[in-house]
Amino acid sequence: ACDTATCVTHRLAGLLSRSGGVVKNNFVPTNVGSKAF
């Protein structure tokens, strides 16, 4: 899977969208590695 910063950011945005934004406050691109997905 793509693990560039841009891929991580877009994947996280999708996850936030699907979850309705109900995730931890520190669940942001710069805190999340590709393995979190």
Epitope: C2, T4, A5, T6, T9, H10, L16, T30
Partner: antibody, heavy 119, light 107 residues
Framework: EVQLVQSGAEVKKPGASVKVSCKAS????????MNWVRQAPGQRLEWMGD????????TYNQKFKGRVTITVDKSASTAYMELSSLRSEDTAVYYC????????????WGQGTTVTVSS | DIQMTQSPSSVSASVGDRVTITCKAS??????VAWYQQKPGKSPKALIY???YRYSGVPSRFSGSGSGTDFTLTISSLQPEDFATYYC?????????FGGGTKVEIK
Amino acid sequence: EVQLVQSGAEVKKPGASVKVSCKASGYTFTDYYMNWVRQAPGQRLEWMGDINPNNVVTTYNQKFKGRVTITVDKSASTAYMELSSLRSEDTAVYYCASIIIVPDYFDYWGQGTTVTVSS
Amino acid sequence: DIQMTQSPSSVSASVGDRVTITCKASQNVGSNVAWYQQKPGKSPKALIYSASYRYSGVPSRFSGSGSGTDFTLTISSLQPEDFATYYCQQYNSYPYTFGGGTKVEIK
């Protein structure tokens, strides 16, 4: 409103260095990666590198062979791109850019900084 | 580095025309492609990410498709404000790379 505001135009001599700043506002600066991209006159866009402002880890385009250094000042929500050993081919517009999720999911770009390298 | 080859390099079109721009990657980049619009003297404006998703505020006449190595940006009905240069970008691997651009000109 998310904004990326860059420093003003620079004129440099060959062999000198230039440091361009990018002041971020309207979002949490440390939450999102910052990219630097340049565009020489009439040329395609060229990615230079990015930085994670949270842990200050950088990734660079090896084309620049150690000439580029990206840094941040977290307290000032500002990113910097320094390019050393300037040559005429480095004459370009330099942009900072960041993909933000909150408050608005978008790929934001600074207004650009023109760097002219001339003897 | 991954090469992104755009075609055509320029296209002349009229308001209301359908315009298609293609981008070919030198190796598989999945769906990790973005499209940008740039007007003279201005910063690039993001249109599409992940090959086919429009950013909020981008008109629905812009659409993207493709995966792997072949990608397309389509403007379904060209508007006066759409005359600009368009760039594709791959962000599947470092360094990110851009296509050479397609200039959409008034016929």
